[in-house]
Amino acid sequence: SGTTNTVAAYNLTWKSTNFKTILEWEPKPVNQVYTVQISTKSGDWKSKCFYTTDTECDLTDEIVKDVKQTYLARVFSYPAGNVESTGSAGEPLYENSPEFTPYLETNLGQPTIQSFEQVGTKVNVTVEDERTLVRRNNTFLSLRDVFGKDLIYTLYYWKSSSSGKKTAKTHTNEFLIDVDKGENYCFSVQAVIPSRKVNRKSTDSPVECMGQEKGEFRE
């Protein structure tokens, strides 16, 4: 069904990292334009990206209203220059996205080691608490604010002179680990949500090593 010369969108895909959420689809339009709608299970559909020739639509502003809700988007196809035209059923051609629950599915962005500080045989490693686009009381929440204790960080650390890695875990953004005095260590961290079925882990942070400028050493 649908208007002659318009084709339905396909391969609707959610791309989401730290709640920055974009819907992508195909095909590149030829003589047609798209409008996107998004809704929770309430069926209160909100239109976005009106009559666009893009094949993506940033839906972040909608999903951050409640990241624990499940969303569905749909992409409508209209003939270019005749957006009032409808298909044989009296409705424009459209396709639904997969369901998307941001809290359960947004990818965890690559974390960053903010700092590390050595005091004697202990090193305190701090992970940057990345800001998200989720808002509460007009302020942007951090990843930790949103996920709370659901989010853990895993620290991988090793002596610069060897390849044997050790791991530590924290429910905060800080690690306190024991190190051998006089040895330089390298660190990498990974964000993890153990309770998830999918997208449980982020990619590893860039490696930071002692003796470089992020670190601080005190006897």
Epitope: S1, G2, A8, S39, T40, K41, S42, G43, D44, W45, Q69, L72, S88, A89, G90, E91, E95, N96
Partner: antibody
Framework: EVQLLESGGGLVQPGGSLRLSCAAS????????MSWVRQAPGKGLEWVSS????????YYTDSVKGRFTISRDNSKNTLYLQMNSLRAEDTAVYYC???????????WGQGTLVTVSS | DIQMTQSPPSLSASAGDRVTITCRAS??????LAWYQQKPEKAPKSLIY???SLQSGVPSRFSGSGSGTDFTLTISSLQPEDFATYYC?????????FGQGTKLEIK
């Protein structure tokens, strides 16, 4: 557990009115679109009406437009169907159902019988 | 309005059988189709949505397939509790419409 409990059915004369209610529990009512579906005796299912979670969007099958009004009170977790100018062909069991995105019907009540007869 | 045609209208089968019910839409509805089961004097129960997604709590012997205009509901190995009437429903566009039903009876 999702529970939907219809009430308000009964015997009414042609041209009369009835208001059906559906009390919902076990889920966040305002987060879901809701629908009414009916089934005439010995017949199949017929979608009647749907309403979005906010109540801002309503939809009706052609045969009831202008006669039936769907509404909801999210503070009372209750769905309504006001039926006016009833006809013999409106005789049916009326089911309320939860309707994610206003699409399919994932949970149903037990139904309430409306009989339109003189 | 979109017409939904189910076949067969009735079907006799035995426990353990593999059964397929078909539903055809009068125009393309992508995957916007649901299947329901109804037993006598009971409310319908949701089985499948989005043509092939199994509703939570529904046994895996039920499966759905199809897109566009032609859809099937398959029960891989009939159980005694599966004897009932089955309905398809399109939710592509209002007014939503159901098939006329397929009554599955014990042979």
């Amino acid at each position: 557990e999702v529970q939907l409990l219809e009430s308000g059915g009964g015997l009414v004369q042609p041209g009369g009115s009835l208001r059906l209610s559906c009390a919902a529990s076990g889920f966040t009512f305002s987060n879901y679109a809701m629908s009414w579906v009916r089934q005439a005796p010995g017949k199949g299912l017929e979608w009647v009406s749907s309403i979005s979670g906010s109540g801002d969007y309503t939809y009706y099958t052609d045969s009831v437009k202008g006669r039936f009004t769907i509404s909801r009170d999210n503070s009372k977790n209750t769905l309504y169907l006001q039926m006016n100018s009833l006809r013999a062909e409106d005789t049916a069991v009326y089911y309320c159902a939860r309707s994610p995105w206003g699409y399919y019907l994932d949970s149903w009540g037990q139904g309430t019988l409306v009989t339109v007869s003189s | 309005d979109i017409q939904m045609t189910q076949s067969p209208p009735s079907l006799s089968a035995s426990a353990g059988d593999r059964v397929t019910i078909t539903c055809r839409a009068s125009q393309g509805i992508s995957s916007r189709l649901a299947w329901y089961q109804q037993k006598p004097e009971k409310a319908p129960k949701s089985l499948i949505y989005a043509a092939s997604s199994l509703q939570s709590g529904v046994p895996s012997r039920f499966s759905g397939s199809g897109s566009g205009t032609d859809f099937t509901l398959t029960i891989s190995s009939l159980q005694p509790e599966d004897f009932a009437t089955y309905y398809c429903q399109q939710y592509n566009s209002y007014p939503y419409t159901f098939g006329q039903g397929t009554k599955l009876e014990i042979k």
